[in-house]
């Protein structure tokens, strides 16, 4: 007896973080035996969409002509072959930006910092929010994620960096969000350029440092989901 059908691959073009009103295409790639593709959104009351395969039948296109809050969320896809439905794909998290007004990002005491010293990036929103996210351009995992406990609403989040090294230099933006949907983000803040000047000693971050020290933004996953009980706003890792 044949084993379960291999799971399809799910991805989004031009990417999985989409501004409000922009178009996005979700692709599901299965096998040449696929007769139909289905897209399911997590916690939705019915199948999200179904499409016939494009020739040569190994993938299907799900088009979103204009991104809105309706489409933000976590998706999986399946394909149906003559022997039944496949296993689900790995999830795709589709995030919409532009749901709320943009926060302000600043550096304390200054965006000009000497290597080995400390700097804190401060993300401030006009209205109270419970999740703040920090992005560094061109980082492999470009997000730090701070969330308040018990949905407590705050106007700002601090992202301390210590000790600063040359790898911390670069362009940052921050987003704010409400906890009821981690897939809806604010407009991005204006960019902040963090400039790290050299010193006699240029300490490199230790790979074995504890999580209680601030990690570099490139060390964090894109959409953390785990949580640990803390008071105030704290960092969360998957």
């Amino acid at each position: 007896q044949a084993g379960p059908l291999p799971k399809p691959t799910l991805w989004a073009e031009p990417g999985s973080v989409i501004s409000w009103g922009n178009s996005v295409t979700i692709w599901c790639q299965g096998t040449l035996e696929a007769r139909e593709y289905r897209l399911d959104k997590e916690e939705s009351p019915a199948p999200w969409d179904r499409q016939n395969p494009l020739e040569p039948k190994n993938k299907a296109r799900f088009s979103i002509p204009s991104m809105t809050e309706d489409y933000a969320g976590r998706y999986r896809c399946y394909y149906r072959s003559p022997v039944g439905w496949s296993q689900p794909s790995d999830p795709l998290e589709l995030v919409m930006t532009g749901a709320y007004s943009k926060p302000t990002l600043s550096a304390l005491p200054s965006p000009l910092v000497t290597s080995g010293k400390s700097v804190t990036l401060l993300c401030q929103s006009r209205s109270p929010m419970d999740t703040f996210l920090l992005i560094k351009e061109r980082a492999a995992h470009p997000l730090l994620h701070l969330r308040s406990e018990h949905g407590a609403q705050q106007h700002q989040a601090e992202f301390p960096m210590s000790p600063v090294t040359s790898v911390h230099g670069g362009t940052y933006r921050c987003f704010s969000s409400h906890g009821f949907s981690h897939y809806l983000l604010s407009h991005p803040s204006d960019p902040l350029e963090l400039i790290v000047s050299g010193s006699l000693e240029d300490p490199r971050p230790s790979p074995t440092r504890s999580v209680s020290t601030a990690a570099g933004p490139e060390d964090q996953p894109l959409m953390p989901t785990g949580s640990v009980p803390h008071s105030g706003l704290r960092r969360h890792w998957e």
Partner: antibody, heavy 122, light 109 residues
Framework: QVQLVESGGGVVQPGRSLRLSCAAS????????IHWVRQAPGKGLEWVAV????????YYADSVKGRFTISRDNSKNTLYLQMNSLRAEDTAVYYC???????????????WGQGTLVTVSS | DAVVTQESALTTSPGETVTVTCRSS?????????ANWVQEKPDHLFTGLIG???NRAPGVPARFSGSLIGDKAALTITGAQTEDEAIYFC?????????FGGGTKLTVL
């Protein structure tokens, strides 16, 4: 045209069982999820359960969970509701209602049957 | 358990715009609740009007529209007709179950 016809209602004693059926026609049954919804005399609507097109996803209201089972036979274009351990508060008209093929292209609860009355009384 | 609340009754005149609202006891109604609207006419004739991803069921007149207004779901009838006199139920989805509101009796005088 789309038609949903419920049957199987009647008078039953508390603690006993009953099975309702919903016969569908006028559309490709195997493409659609189907709901059971009930309305107690003089009351509003209460959602009971839904089953997805392929029978693999089933959801229930807390008030019937563990007592009622929704199922379907796509080869017979028929939906079922097996009701066990019936209580007086289950007395209602039971309707089947069509769900969507997909959320991006349809409206849940778009077509309804005429209902079948279940009376639980000693 | 979540409770969904609607106005018990509303009265409007032909040609007027009327809005039926739907509130959730758990907080703001969001797109994740997939607000759905069902019309009940005399003799227990039920019809789905609006739901899914802001879809209008085939044959439902364009004067019926659904939206989120503030923290509630809303059904707006723009230019009500006498035949719109009915009971309107909203249904909200809560991750793994639907909950219906108590219904709004709309009178068109």
């Amino acid at each position: 045209q789309v038609q949903l016809v419920e049957s199987g209602g009647g008078v039953v004693q508390p603690g006993r069982s009953l099975r309702l059926s919903c016969a569908a026609s006028g559309f490709t049954f195997s493409n659609y999820g189907i709901h059971w919804v009930r309305q107690a005399p003089g009351k509003g609507l209460e959602w009971v359960a839904v089953i997805w097109f392929d029978g693999n996803n089933k959801y229930y209201a807390d008030s019937v969970k563990g007592r009622f089972t929704i199922s379907r036979d796509n080869s017979k274009n028929t939906l079922y509701l097996q009701m066990n351990s019936l209580r007086a508060e289950d007395t209602a008209v039971y309707y089947c209602a069509r769900d969507v093929i997909t959320l991006v292209r349809g409206v849940p609860f778009d077509y309804w049957g005429q209902g079948t009355l279940v009376t639980v009384s000693s | 358990d979540a409770v969904v609340t609607q106005e018990s009754a509303l009265t409007t005149s032909p040609g007027e715009t009327v809005t039926v609202t739907c509130r959730s006891s758990t907080g703001a109604v969001t797109t994740s609740n997939y607000a759905n609207w069902v019309q009940e006419k005399p003799d227990h004739l039920f019809t789905g009007l609006i739901g899914g991803i802001n879809n209008r069921a085939p044959g439902v007149p364009a004067r019926f529209s659904g939206s989120l207004i503030g923290d509630k779901a809303a059904l707006t009838i723009t230019g009500a007709q006498t035949e719109d006199e009915a009971i309107y139920f909203c249904a909200l989805w809560y991750s793994n179950h639907w909950v219906f509101g108590g219904g709004t009796k709309l009178t068109v005088l």
